[in-house]
């Protein structure tokens, strides 16, 4: 190899060891029998050398640095050449460095031809191995603007007082042009301006200077976004830190065309603007930091550009002004992440503050819109608390548990609507009465409706789930001892059509001691399946539950248990079941931890089934499933 550098070229070539392949033996640069591991060639020098190994690219790297002095004479503006040409260099990983020094008053602009640049964060690498590292200068301090790959949106970077650009090319890369030019500009009066151009839908992730280290104190950095007028842009902060300010405040400023309040100033912790049409600027302003404990200011953010959806021009009014103790959250439904570009899906408050989730609270009227390509990516979860503090005032009072029509009219699927029903301890209990009788969901007879009610205790220390219930069964009412949550959960978009079937009334009733009482009025047509609460986890210790089962005059009920033994093993106390005829008060008592469960039995009159648990040993829980079937009395039962 021969490298000859012209005089006055201000180019230095340095060949040095990279990260060695540890299993290999050392490779050397050989110059007339001398073996060396570092070779520096300066302007005006000509050196002939070889390598002592077959694959020097596994051992050495080459750095070509050109110093461009704009202080003492005119600046060589225009397209930047790769000198010496890559064809004259040994095939090593190579880094071309241009170090431009200029006066503080002169602005320098790097212009990148297509493909534009894409900024990468710490630990990331470029797929083709070609990286652009750009840094600036504040007095004598070097400031890293960022590291960039090809195929992005960054088209121009403006700086002043000097710029250092390093282009890293892997040894196998055929590139023989720099891909950028330098132009002079008037002073930009800030650290730098980065221009990011979107031709169509897409996203860009950008970072403050020196990221992930701290942004220079009291500096200003601007990003200019060029967005076609027919598209919408949204900004979201992925990661940020604030420093400890002594004077001034760290902030971001937006210049949004058409806004009457330019510049719009936001704190970094604020929700950032979304649904912006056309071009806009974003600036990051630092502060004077506390000398003793400066902290660091840093910001990583994403700009998402996409087509406005039909929905984005529609305003939905959610009137919660007459509601109390209620919150509505619109959020993304969980999905597997895909690797391709996915347009953002945002919900916007007052059309401007857009984010991937939004919580609305009672007491106000809210105006919302959507910036989303597919609204099935979102769902709604609502919580409402109905509480009684004064038992004298609440007793016999009823509340309808219905999803308000405002919520049903939103173009987003309702997932859960939860009512938390709170009563004064040991004073009142609750009764749930459905508009349509309910079926308990079991493996034997699953619910196939578009929604179900999930009923569970709302006492933090109590792990008690009564079950999942849907319309179209035989359960006429559910009485519960104390605080519960009732969640209407939807399973299909057809809930909108079936919404009329929902309807549950809760009433506050005098206190009773049992954990729950189910009133069951079976239909002649079908078998009713019932199971103990907390199925799969076991009925909680010392808990008692009852079923009040009605048998019409002309019918006989067959009560069948689905296993021979309960399987419960008691640590303390006894587990028992009482089956009691309501008319005669005759009762049968079964010890669940000892006896076998009763064989199928026939009941001519309404009867009670009461199950009371002991304190079971772990793993030996009480789970019972039974069925009730009605048959006409005229049939010979022998």
């Amino acid at each position: 190899f021969e490298i000859a550098l012209p005089r006055e070229s201000n180019i230095t070539v340095l060949i040095k060891l990279g990260t060695p392949t540890l299993l290999a033996k050392p490779c050397y640069i050989v110059i007339s029998k001398r073996h060396i591991t570092m070779l520096s060639i300066k302007s005006g020098e000509r050196i002939v050398f070889t390598f002592s190994c077959q694959s020097p690219e596994n051992h050495f790297v080459i750095e070509i640095q050109k110093n461009i002095d704009c202080m003492s004479g005119p600046c060589p503006f225009g397209e930047v050449q790769l000198q010496p040409s890559t064809s004259l260099l040994p095939t090593l990983n190579r880094t071309f460095i241009w170090d431009v020094k200029a006066h503080k008053s002169i602005g320098l602009e790097l212009q990148f031809s297509i493909p534009r640049l894409r900024q990468i964060g710490p630990g990331e690498s470029c797929p083709d191995g070609v990286t652009h590292s750009i840094s600036g200068r504040i007095d004598a301090t070097v400031v890293r603007i960022g590291t960039f790959c090809s195929n992005g949106t960054v088209s121009r970077i403006k700086m002043q007082e000097g710029v250092k650009m390093a282009l890293h090319l892997p040894w196998f890369h055929p590139r023989n042009v720099s891909g950028f030019s330098i132009a002079n500009r008037s002073s930009i009066k800030r650290l730098c301006i980065i221009e990011s151009v979107f031709e169509g839908e897409g996203s860009a992730t950008l970072m403050s200077a020196n990221y992930p280290e701290g942004f220079p104190e009291d500096e200003l950095m601007t990003w200019q976004f060029v967005v076609p007028a027919h598209l919408r842009a949204s900004v979201s902060f992925l990661n940020f830190n604030l420093s400890n300010c002594e004077r001034k405040e760290e902030r971001v400023e937006y210049y949004i065309p058409g806004s009457t309040t330019n510049p719009e100033v936001f704190k970094l912790e604020d929700k950032q603007p979304g649904n912006m049409a056309g071009n806009f600027n974003l600036s990051l302003q630092g502060c004077d930091q506390d000398a003793q404990s400066p902290g660091i200011l840093r910001l990583q953010f994403q700009v998402l550009v996409q087509h406005p959806q039909n929905e984005s021009n529609k305003i939905y009014v959610v009137d919660l002004s007459n509601e109390r103790a209620m919150s509505l959250t619109i959020e993304p439904r969980p999905v597997k992440q895909s690797r391709k570009f996915v347009p953002g899906c945002f919900v916007c408050l007052e059309s401007r503050t857009c984010s991937s989730n939004l919580t609305l609270t009672s007491g106000s009227k809210h105006k919302i819109s959507f910036l989303c390509d597919d609204l099935t990516r979102l769902w709604m979860n609502v919580e409402k608390t109905i509480s009684c503090t004064d038992h004298r005032y609440c007793q016999r009072k009823s509340y309808s548990l219905q999803v308000p029509s405002d919520i049903l009219h939103l173009p987003v699927e309702l997932h859960d609507f939860s009512w938390k029903l709170l009563v004064p301890k040991d004073r009142l209990s609750l009764v749930l009465v459905p508009a349509q009788k309910l079926q308990q969901h079991t493996h034997e007879k699953p619910c196939n409706t578009s929604f179900s009610y999930l009923v569970a205790s709302a006492i933090p220390s109590q792990d008690l789930y009564f079950g999942s219930f849907c319309p179209g069964g035989s359960i006429k009412q559910i009485q519960v001892k104390q605080n519960i949550s009732v969640t209407l959960r939807t399973f299909a978009p057809s809930f909108q059509q079936e919404a009329s079937r929902q309807g549950l009334t809760v009433s506050f009733i005098p206190y009773f001691k049992e954990e729950g009482v189910f009133t069951v009025t079976p239909d002649t047509k079908s078998k009713v399946y019932l199971r103990t609460p907390n199925w799969d986890r076991g009925l909680p210790s010392l808990t008692s539950v009852s079923w009040n089962i009605s048998v019409p005059r002309d019918q006989v009920a067959c009560l069948t248990f689905f296993k021979e033994r309960s399987g419960v093993v008691c640590q303390t106390g006894r587990a028992f079941m009482i089956i009691q005829e309501q008319r005669t008060r005759a009762e049968e008592i079964f010890s669940l931890d000892e006896d076998v469960l009763p064989k199928p039995s026939f009941h001519h009159h309404s009867f009670w089934v009461n199950i009371s648990n002991c304190s079971p040993t772990s793993g030996k829980q009480l789970d019972l499933l039974f069925s009730v079937t009605l048959t006409p009395r005229t049939v010979d039962l022998t």
Epitope: L23, K25, P26, T37, M38
Partner: antibody
Amino acid sequence: QVQLVQSGAEVKKPGSSVKVSCKASGFNIKDYYMNWVRQAPGQGLEWIGWIDPENANTIYDPKFQGRVTITADESTSTAYMELSSLRSEDTAVYYCYGSSYRFTYWGQGTLVTVSS
Amino acid sequence: EIVLTQSPATLSLSPGERATLSCSASSSVSYLYWYQQKPGQAPRPWIYLTSNLASGVPARFSGSGSGTDFTLTISSLEPEDFAVYYCQQWSSNPFTFGGGTKVEIK
């Protein structure tokens, strides 16, 4: 298991030559530079030169140039160091070692005594 | 040729103490190697490529440095660490050794 086994001790007259051998096992000498160093009694280590068995290229410390010849026989995985025109100050333990970026394998040393 | 100067020539310390051995090059070197030698034995590879411990070397040893100044540090001396340590450069031939530092029991 990696080993470098050197030939036995030698007593030589001034002006004569000595040829020390170094047989490698457990690794391929083509993947290493085969170096020779010496250590005079109570002194430090002094690098003499090396051979790259892959291409038979050699480098010698200018101090030994003209007096030393390092060779290698790939078929027997053996490196040799011959030092001529011996003087009493050449009395030392001569070590061979194979070197790569990461691994360095040393022989046990061969004592060469030059005495009239 | 690159001259390597090791200092101090002798280091007298007690077990448990920290030892700092220095190796200074007359011109810049890419990487440095360190060897340990005990009386009557061949040198043993100790640190390669400036800071990597050779196989079997305890973690109390560490190597650092760049350019012309390099250091081998033993955080807490054990009885078996008392020996002579040599540095060597592989950056430019002849591939010289330093004069050695003897670490002896005080």
